[in-house]
Interface confidence: low
């Protein structure tokens, strides 16, 4: 099977491709002989053979024609040859050799047939990896050796090669002289031209140019080695927005696809509810009534405002109301749905409404609710209210359709009284305590009576006593002497009990005398 020549090799001489005689100079004439043959693919080739193994002191030279250097700095000589094993040739004693020598000479012009051994410089002694025996020869199994040598730097316009035989049985099947170039290539979307390497150990730095519809991400560079190899690329180009890498090029995104950013990612399919009709789109247009919020990435589907909340339920407790509702059937395709509560205080005619007082409180808040419940407190008693629950999402403000809300109307009840704030101890004795207090700040109606709850502190509320007082003072008797009691008082109106006051602690006297006018703790 024919092995193709690597693309980074440029031939200066290939004996296999020369038609007819090679016409190289052989000196002396009884040395190297040009003979026709065939290569491994049965293609006719010209070879040179010498096999003067019986004679002492062989010095047979073969010189190629003049080879122009072109742009080469370092050249490679590839020799294919067969070499006979001296042990397989009888009676040759010490005259047979299994090596030959390779030489070269640089010159600026063709010297023609003039030949001077001393002008040539030795490249190397060439030995065979595989030599053949007489038996191999009989079977025509000639072991073909390939040897490659480097020469350089070469500076003159051209050169000759020469082969010196010192007593071997050798057939020179092919001679190829080439130099290595780093071939044109596209790497990381940068084009690098054919580059001839330097001969020295240094690398040639080559700047790449970006392919069409791309731009430099980092300046693209590669190093061309002496071996004609492009070494690890540095930097790269990346396809512009609207273009993607396909077959070493940047090609436009097809309709229905887009690419928002410069870079080497692929074009992406337009997200749901968006489309594009042109080649090379950087983003996709939203369908009618669908939108993209400012912070939505181009990769996100276009979305729309949510539908109204559903199933609003109100739970009224005096001057508070808990509102619960269900999520909209359609969130518009977004996860950022929130709810706003619009509170309106209405007269007995539901159409005559005004915004609620700023004192009305919303728990956890009035706007931007993420859950489907809110508690509204500090409403006025016996008042009509309408609550509108708006469902909004990130694109609500971009759309022109009206607000998506659900409304519920309620009427508050009478509120219970607010807590008693302070309790004062008027007198104490061994077994009684007299207390007084002020009416709650917000009685929210006529106070019918007060509930006084007390217990021994050390009992920790496991057993307590409740008594009722019509006014704002009371004397509690049948207490233990020298004992701390905890007291709480709450007011009652027609709307029910208010919340308990905080806990107050008072102590009975240790003996029979009484103490008066002690303030609360």
């Amino acid at each position: 099977e024919l092995i193709p020549q690597p693309s980074n090799e440029v031939n200066l001489l290939d004996s296999k491709t020369i038609q007819g005689e090679l016409g190289w100079i052989s000196y002396p004439s009884h040395g190297w002989e040009e003979i026709s043959g065939v290569d491994e693919h049965y293609t006719p080739i010209r070879t040179y053979q010498v096999c003067n193994v019986m004679d002492h002191s062989q010095n047979n030279w073969l010189r190629t024609n003049w080879v122009p250097r072109n742009s080469a700095q370092k050249i490679y000589v590839e020799l294919k040859f067969t070499l006979r094993d001296c042990n397989s040739i009888p009676l040759v004693l010490g005259t047979c050799k299994e090596t030959f020598n390779l030489y070269y000479m640089e010159s600026d012009d063709d010297h023609g047939v003039k030949f001077r051994e001393h002008q040539f410089t030795k490249i190397d002694t060439i030995a065979a990896d595989e030599s053949f025996t007489q038996m191999d020869l009989g079977d025509r199994i000639l072991k073909l050796n390939t040897e490659i040598r480097e020469v350089g730097p070469v500076n003159k316009k051209g050169f000759y090669l020469a082969f010196q035989d010192v007593g071997a049985c050798v057939a020179l099947v092919s001679v190829r002289v080439y130099f290595k170039k780093c071939p044109f290539t596209v790497k990381n979307l940068a084009m690098f031209p054919d580059t001839v390497p330097m001969d020295s150990q240094s690398l040639v730095e080559v700047r790449g140019s970006c392919v069409n519809n791309s731009k430099e991400e980092d300046p693209p560079r590669m190093y061309c080695s002496t071996e004609g190899e492009w070494l690890v690329p540095i930097g790269k180009c990346s396809c512009n927005a609207g273009y993607e890498e396909r077959g070493f090029m940047c090609q436009a995104c097809r309709p229905g696809f887009y690419k928002a950013l410069d870079g080497n990612m692929k074009c992406a399919k337009c997200p749901p509810h968006s489309s594009t009709q042109e080649d090379g789109s950087m983003n996709c247009r939203c369908e009618n009534n669908y939108f993209r919020a400012d912070k939505d990435p181009p990769s996100m589907a276009c979305t729309r405002p949510p539908s109204s909340p559903r199933n609003v339920i109100s739970n009224i407790n005096e001057t508070s109301v808990i509102l619960d509702w269900s999520w909209p059937l359609d969130t518009g395709g977004r996860k950022d749905v929130t709810f706003n509560i619009i509170c309106k205080k209405c007269g007995w005619n539901i159409k005559q409404c005004e915004p609620c007082s700023p004192n009305v409180r919303f728990l956890p808040r009035q706007f931007g609710l993420t859950n489907t419940t809110v508690t509204v407190t500090d409403l006025l008693a016996h008042t009509n209210y309408t609550f509108e629950i708006d469902a909004v999402n990130g694109v609500s403000e971009l759309s022109s359709p009206p607000r998506q809300f659900a409304a519920v109307s309620i009427t508050t009840n009478q509120a219970a009284p607010s807590p008693v704030l302070t309790i004062k101890k008027d007198r104490t004795s061994r077994n009684s305590i007299s207390l007084s207090w002020q009416e709650p700040e917000h009685p929210n109606g006529i106070i019918l009576d007060y509930e006084v709850k007390y217990y021994e502190k050390q009992e920790q509320e496991t057993s307590y006593t409740i008594l009722r007082a019509r006014g704002t003072n009371v004397t509690i008797s049948s207490l233990k002497p020298d004992t701390i009691y905890v007291f709480q008082i709450r007011a009652r109106t027609a709307a029910g009990y208010g919340t308990n006051s905080r806990k107050f602690e008072f102590e009975t006297s240790p003996d029979s005398f009484s103490i008066s006018g002690e303030s609360s703790q």
Partner: antibody, heavy 120, light 111 residues
């Protein structure tokens, strides 16, 4: 005559940093690359990274975040710095010259290696 | 990363016989006419020594009884005839791309 010699601390505490110097002779650091390779006791060789003749570097991606290779051409010295050492970084650390002219990344001359033990 | 699998892990060969060590790459390490696969010899207490570079080129001062062959993903190191001084561990290494990686080694013992 080409010669490379590593010098290191021998013992490093866990989480500390390692600094090894490779001093070369017989060739110029501007013309050849130098590789760093390590070999835990009784185990395989692991390539850490290399510095080229022109000073550019290539690292093993597994260790890149912990590794830094630099050199001083005038002093013929190459430096390996590695941080956040753990016990599994215990190894013989070698510097080795790249074949140079051909840029094959074959290492034709090696130092004798310096033994690094990570232990508290 | 390219993984290099060496086989066998160890082998024992008689003096004068042939030792064959295989190295298989997880993907081709050949490119542009070269096979970027190298062989090293390491003896206990010593650094590795370059035997063969680019699959078949003998390193400096390496005896001709060492030879390398192969292309693509399959490579072989041959030693023939084996001599006493060849008892060592042999590693293959690729340089097709970074990171460079080594095989796990083959220990050659003499029978």
């Amino acid at each position: 005559q080409v010669h490379l010699k590593e010098s290191g601390p021998g013992l490093v505490a866990p989480s500390q940093s390692l600094s090894i110097t490779c001093t070369v002779s017989g060739f110029s650091l501007t013309g050849y690359g130098v590789n760093w390779i390590r070999q835990p006791p009784g185990k395989n060789l692991e390539w850490l990274g290399m510095i080229w003749g022109d000073g550019s570097t290539d690292y093993n991606s597994v260790l890149k975040s912990r590794l830094s290779i630099s050199k001083d051409n005038a002093k013929s010295q190459v430096f390996l710095e590695m941080n956040s050492l753990q016990t599994d970084d215990t190894a013989n650390y070698y510097c080795a010259r790249d074949r140079g002219i051909s840029y094959y990344y074959a290492m034709d001359y090696w130092g004798q290696g310096t033994s690094v033990t990570v232990s508290s | 990363d390219i993984v290099l699998t060496q086989s066998p892990a160890s082998l024992a060969v008689s003096l004068g016989q042939r030792a064959t060590i295989s190295c298989r790459a997880s993907k081709s390490v050949s490119a542009s006419g070269y096979s970027y696969l190298h062989w090293y010899q390491q003896k206990p207490g010593q650094p590795p020594k370059l035997l063969i570079f680019l699959a078949y080129n003998l390193g400096s001062g390496v005896p001709a009884r060492f030879s390398g062959s192969g292309a693509g993903t399959d490579f072989t190191l041959n030693i023939h005839p084996v001599e006493e001084e060849d008892a060592a561990t042999y590693y293959c290494q690729h340089s097709r791309e970074f990171p460079l990686t080594f095989g796990a080694g083959t220990k050659l013992e003499l029978k």
